[in-house]
């Protein structure tokens, strides 16, 4: 039977007797930086190409015995996860293997350095069809390690690593931390997360998604025909790698950016129990578990977007948190979280030529985020529409006045440390969807964009108290881009999305008593492009 | 042991009429960094990436090296360069003392120096 | 191209040792073991073992167990099965192929064991 | 006798489709993706023609196709020529070891 990370990677579509999808990766190389591998096991013979790059330290301690089998463990399990034959992700993906662990998995930064390097000048000597890079290894936050993989990442070469087992913030390692990898978190059978020992899988803002990564079945390098289940977030890591392998061997052009999109749109959402990761990291930490697309053709038409979390901005009165896009994304809004519910909003920026999400801290707040909406939309032409504070009673408002461009987010900005003290809030008038309306006290920005054929429509979800949280979702075929509350009270604590649902939280005011005018709103923008979808027919 | 001796002599030699002092000192305001990792256990002192500005081309970044050396044995320090970075980023990997890193730091062409440190299987 | 070549035939009397070798040239040597296969005369074929050019590690099928060692020259790329012990039943050709996945075949040796 | 199981001859005229099965257990073709299949010419070494179940190495004819189903695999010649008279082994992985089929004689009529 199946073995259970290889069913759960796969769309109920293919589940026959055996884990057989198409196209197996056959136009995808796949780097591995790891320890040496039994090149030669059946499981993967001849799909490994061994390298003559070796940067390893030495082993530690002095009666170290230098066992092959024990040298070979971690590197041909990947391997097998990557492309084995029978317990594999992408049976067709070939790959190159790059030695920078040691006989006891201990590798260096500089090590590491010099094998992406190798990389990059074989990319360069022999350019081939597409790449992915997989680091199933992780060290401290290393400002270098990250620089390199933005550079490989820019060169088109798709980089997928380990969270890291340290049961810790991700973004504390790298190259787990680098903004560009894809960053692999891992997860069991029942869908919880890892546990390693005392340890278990990294979490927080820097994961992209979790995979399997307990109990997975791949080669042993203790002889040529044995298996072992080895778990960890390398394994995880793997998984992904073989599905991007998939994924782009059946398109070779994606890019990055939009192999990423994919990666979350087609992954299984919400399945993750987070009650396991610690309080203040579940709203950051991604509840996505990888999966390979139904089919490998025709998500071209969806308008992807994913939510990007900024790092906390510390509790300065001063201090702002950034959320940045990658550079072929679209920031179509921008929205703000504060815990304390102590902030000052939000406001989309440009910063050296691109659109930022920056978050506001407030007097005696214990820190912001920004949180930033950011989608895949060709050939768009984006904008940010300011109104300065209103101060009359109506509130403060500001709509896309040009031709042909649709509201795609809101955010609202102020100076006042508390706007929940300056009454009264005002709920936006209906039937103006291209208009942003919010506290007359603070200045609103409207994100415009036109693309073609491009849509959006708002949602609005209220209840007469807070209770904690309010959602509304965009309905199948609409993607939500833009997410945030009305009105901009104190005991708003913030707007974030999740996948397609607008989630705005606020403090349960039941204990302090509440009034019908502390309503609480939750706007969603949905969008989808009439473009996409007729092209992708077209394709058809 | 030998060898090493011998790389250091070499060295002196090849250098001796390289100018002292500092040329081509970095542009005014931009300091070079240096970063090390966090996690004690995992730091590597005594390799160090010295990480040069974007645009550097591979024979400067050879020259910055050289220049260290140079500048590091009239200090009657031995370093050795394990590898010169280009394709990704322009720098070199360089075994030497942590005394030289305010010497390093002030090198042309530097951006920032990280001291290298250990990366592990997950 | 890729490409294993075999030993001449050999003749040998029963309780006799035989070693076959197979050069191989053409690919990433560590990247496939090799697979010994042999033929009896108008019979099927019979999977002897295979040995791993990457650190020399066997695989022995259980027939033959204890009469066969495979073993390899990783200077000269060749790869070596001898049988002792032999018996008339061991006549037959005797072919190396690449891998498990015996994508490429030497030419076969064949050989005979007769008093 | 062989682990798989294969008729010992079939026999089709040219342009005609032929298919031979290969029946194994669980452990064997059932259990692994690694079914293979080989032509052979009296006097030559076997040639692969179908590895993995169903995939043909390059310079193979897409005459020549390969499938399974629970424990049994199958190839299947169409457009059958004179020159794919020969013998047709199978053969599989267990989970230490390789297993052939005794063998398939075709007969192209």
């Known amino acids: 039977s199946i073995p259970w990370n290889l069913e759960r990677i796969t769309p109920p579509r293919y589940r026959a007797d055996e884990y057989q999808p198409p196209d197996g990766g056959s136009l995808v190389e796949v780097y591995l930086l790891d320890t040496s591998i039994q090149s030669d096991h059946r499981e993967i013979e001849g799909r490994v190409m061994v390298t003559d790059f070796e940067n390893v330290p030495e082993e530690d301690g002095t009666r170290f015995h230098r066992q092959a089998s024990k040298c070979d463990s971690h590197g041909t399990h990947l391997a097998g996860v990557v492309s084995g034959r029978d317990a594999g992700v992408a049976k067709g993906a070939s790959m190159r293997s790059l030695r920078v662990l040691n006989c006891q998995g201990k590798g260096t930064v500089s090590g590491t350095l010099i094998g992406l390097e190798f990389i990059r000048k074989s990319q360069l000597v022999q350019p081939v069809g597409p790449l992915v890079v997989l680091l199933p290894l992780a060290g401290g936050y290393s400002r270098v390690l990250n620089a390199a993989c933005q550079r490989l990442a820019r060169a088109g070469v798709v980089l997928v690593t380990a969270a890291g087992n340290f049961r810790d913030d991700a973004c504390l390692y790298s190259p787990a931390s680098a903004p560009e990898v894809i960053t692999v978190g891992a997860t069991n059978a029942q869908d919880q997360p890892v546990t390693l020992g005392t340890l278990g899988t990294n979490f927080g803002r820097c994961v992209d998604l979790f995979a399997p990564g307990e109990d997975i079945i791949g080669a042993s390098s203790d002889c040529s025909t044995c298996f072992v289940s080895q778990s960890g977030t390398s394994q995880a890591a793997a998984h992904v790698a073989g599905i991007a392998a998939m994924m782009l061997s059946a398109e070779p052009e994606l890019t990055l950016a939009e192999l990423r999109q994919r990666l979350i749109h087609f992954s299984a959402k919400d399945v993750i129990n987070e009650a396991w990761f610690p309080e203040d990291q579940r709203v950051l930490t991604p509840n996505l578990v990888a999966a390979l697309p139904p089919s490998t053709h025709g998500a071209g038409w969806q308008l992807f977007c994913r939510t990007v979390w900024s790092a906390h901005s510390g509790p300065t009165r001063m201090a702002t948190a950034i959320a940045r896009c990658a550079p072929d994304e679209e920031l179509l809004s921008c929205s703000s979280f504060s815990r304390s519910g102590k902030r000052r909003g939000e406001r989309m920026e440009a910063q050296g030529g691109k659109l930022v999400c920056r978050a506001h801290n407030a007097f005696g707040g214990e820190g912001v985020y920004a949180i930033a909406r950011c989608c895949l939309l060709p050939q768009a032409n984006c904008s940010v529409h300011t109104a300065p504070p209103a101060e009359a009673s109506m509130g403060t408002r500001v709509h896309c006045h040009q031709q042909g461009h649709v509201l795609t987010g809101c955010s609202s900005h102020w100076e006042v440390e508390d706007l929940g003290t300056h009454k009264p809030p005002v709920l936006r008038p209906r039937g103006q969807p291209n208009q942003c309306v919010g506290h007359r006290e603070a200045s609103i920005h409207a994100s415009c964009c036109h693309a073609p054929g491009l849509e959006c429509k708002v949602k609005e979800h209220g209840i007469p108290a807070p209770q904690g949280q309010v959602t509304v979702a965009c309905e199948e075929g609409w993607t939500l881009t833009g997410c945030s509350a009305l009105p901009g009270t104190s005991h708003v604590l913030g707007a974030y999305a999740v996948d397609n649902t607008c989630v705005v939280r606020s403090r349960d005011v039941s204990t302090t008593g509440s009034t019908s005018e502390e309503a609480v709103t939750a706007v969603a923008i949905c969008c989808r492009s009439r473009h996409l979808a007729q092209a992708s027919q077209e394709l058809q | 042991q030998e060898d090493e001796d011998g790389d250091y002599e070499e060295l002196v030699l090849a250098l001796r009429s390289e100018e002292d002092g500092l040329a081509e000192a970095p542009e005014h305001g931009t300091t070079a960094t240096f970063h090390r990792c966090a996690k004690d256990p995992w730091r590597l002192p005594g390799t160090y990436v010295v990480v040069l500005k974007e645009e550097t081309h591979l024979s400067q970044s050879e020259r910055t090296a050289r220049r260290l050396q140079a500048q590091a044995a009239r200090r009657g320090y031995l370093t050795k360069i394990l590898h010169v970075f280009h394709g990704l980023l322009p720098g070199f990997l360089v075994k030497m003392s942590g005394d030289l890193l305010e010497l390093a730091l002030k090198l042309p062409h530097v951006d920032y120096i990280e001291e290298d440190s250990s990366v592990f299987a997950q | 191209q890729v490409q294993l070549v075999q030993s001449g035939a050999e003749v040998k009397k029963p309780g006799a040792s035989l070693k076959v070798s197979c050069k191989a040239s053409?690919?990433?040597?560590?990247?496939?073991?090799i697979s010994w296969v042999r033929q009896a005369p108008g019979q099927g074929l019979e999977w002897m073992g295979w040995i791993s050019a990457y650190n020399g590690n066997t695989n022995y099928a259980q027939k033959v167990q204890g009469r066969v060692t495979m073993t390899t020259d990783t200077s000269t790329s060749t790869v070596y099965m001898e049988v002792r012990s032999l018996r008339s039943d061991d006549t037959a050709v005797y072919y190396c192929?690449?891998?498990?996945?015996?994508?490429?075949w030497g030419q076969g040796t064949t050989v005979t064991v007769s008093s | 006798q062989s682990a798989l199981t294969q008729p010992a001859s079939v026999s089709g005229s040219p342009g005609q489709s032929i298919t031979i099965s290969c029946t194994g257990t669980?452990?064997?073709?059932?259990?692994?993706?690694?079914v293979s299949w080989y032509q052979q010419h009296p006097g030559k070494p076997p040639k692969l023609m179908i590895y993995e179940v169903s995939n043909r190495p390059s310079g193979v004819s897409n005459r020549f196709s390969g499938s399974k189903s629970g424990n049994t695999a199958s190839l299947t010649i169409s457009g059958l020529q004179a020159e794919d008279e020969a013998d047709y082994f199978c053969s599989s992985y267990t989970s230490t070891s390789m297993v052939f089929g005794g063998g398939t004689k075709l007969t192209v009529l």
């Open positions: 192929a690449r891998g498990y996945g015996m994508d490429v």
């Open positions: 669980s452990s064997d073709v059932g259990g692994y993706n690694s």
């Open positions: 053409g690919y990433s040597l560590t990247s496939y073991g």
